[in-house]
């Protein structure tokens, strides 16, 4: 039985050119990540495995940079950036977990970051 | 305290399989992964690849993907690397070492001679 | 797979000495470096991670600095002990690859 929840850093928002931290934190079950996939509406950006460190999808890796911890930071970013995020959590023995997050960029100055929660 | 443990020095025809073992101690063996890492004479070190002691997920280094083979058994805490079809320049020290945190080797084993002469 | 280029190959300091060595991957490891210390006939010892943690146990003249693909290990104040072979290693994405070395000699 799947225990888990997926926090994230929900909706978000950020300013063109700027940079942003996508963040997941999976409580409540005691399975064992062995990976983390960060997905673009259906592109892969990066993989983190347990075993094996992370993996940037070559046309990414000029504005994704791994971390911190599990997370994501792009950086960058273009109004095309704008969508939705997924971070899935390959777990052991429970399965697949899967938080979303809407990452809106703005081209003014007002940009505002959405409530976030600490992640240990 | 925490300590990885290895088999004795081999010595080994071309052709021939080697198996080394490495029994951890001092903490909980499937918490951690177990990598093999070896060093032949006077050259750096050379990464072979990782067993995972939990769900036994194994990947390799693919320069030595086919002749490599990693076990484990979680009954005696004990990893064990297997690498046959030996040549000349499988000649090195072989070692066992634990990626503590992550990726990197904070726990190592004594290391095991294994020489391929014939 | 990730090149790890080590300079120098050998040096020869005197106790007291601050020493320098670096270690530059053939491309973007963000800061996924680690530094270790050999002695003759014995395993690796970690130093340092992440580019600049220190090991649990590791005297505080060693220290690593740098990101991406330029990076640095400094002992500030070299003893008897620290003659030995020093080796990088990144941690970002396997296969791990190490640097060929550098070897610290008694001048």
């Known amino acids: 039985m799947m225990t888990g929840t997926i926090e994230t850093t929900g909706n978000i928002s950020a300013e063109k050119g700027g940079s942003i931290i996508l963040q997941c934190h999976l409580s409540s079950t005691t399975a064992q990540v062995t990976q983390v996939n960060w997905e673009q509406q259906d592109q892969l950006l990066a993989i983190c495995n347990a075993d094996l460190g992370w993996h940037i999808s070559p046309s990414f890796k000029d504005r994704v940079a791994p971390g911190p911890g599990l997370g994501l930071t792009l950086q960058s970013l273009t109004v095309n950036d704008t969508g939705e995020y997924f971070c899935i959590y390959h777990t052991y023995p429970d399965g697949t977990y899967t938080g979303r997050i809407f990452l809106e960029v703005l081209e003014s100055s007002v940009a505002e970051h959405g409530a976030r929660f600490q992640i240990p | 305290q925490l300590q990885l443990v290895q088999s004795g020095a081999e010595v080994k025809k071309p052709g021939a399989s080697v198996k080394v073992s490495c029994k951890a101690s001092?903490?909980?063996?499937?918490?951690?992964?177990m990598n093999w890492v070896r060093q032949a004479p006077g050259q750096s070190l050379e990464w072979i690849g990782v067993?995972?002691?939990?769900?036994?997920?194994?990947s390799y280094n693919q320069k030595f993907k086919g002749r490599v083979t990693m076990t484990r058994d979680q009954s005696t805490s004990t990893a064990y690397m297997e690498l046959n079809s030996l040549r000349s320049e499988d000649t090195a020290v072989y070692y066992c070492?634990?990626?503590?945190?992550?990726?990197?080797?904070?726990?190592w084993g004594q290391g095991t001679l294994v020489t391929v002469s014939s | 797979d990730i090149q790890m280029t080590q300079s120098p190959s050998s040096l020869s300091a005197s106790v007291g000495d601050r020493v320098t060595i670096t270690c530059r991957p053939s491309?973007?490891?963000?800061?996924?470096l680690a530094w270790y210390q050999q002695k003759p006939g014995k395993a690796p010892k970690l130093l340092i991670y992440n580019a600049k943690a220190l090991a649990e146990g590791v005297p505080s003249r060693f220290s690593g600095s740098g990101s991406g693909t330029d990076f640095t290990l400094t002992i500030s104040s070299l003893q008897p002990e620290d003659f030995a072979t020093y080796y990088c290693?990144?941690?970002?994405?396997?296969?791990?690859?190490f640097g060929q070395g550098t070897k610290v000699e008694i001048k």
């Open positions: 491309e973007n490891i963000y800061s996924y």
């Open positions: 001092g903490y909980s063996f499937t918490d951690y992964n």
């Open positions: 067993i995972n002691p939990n769900h036994g997920t194994i």
């Open positions: 290693q990144h941690h970002f994405g396997a296969p791990w690859t």
């Open positions: 070492a634990n990626n503590w945190d992550v990726w990197y080797f904070d726990v």
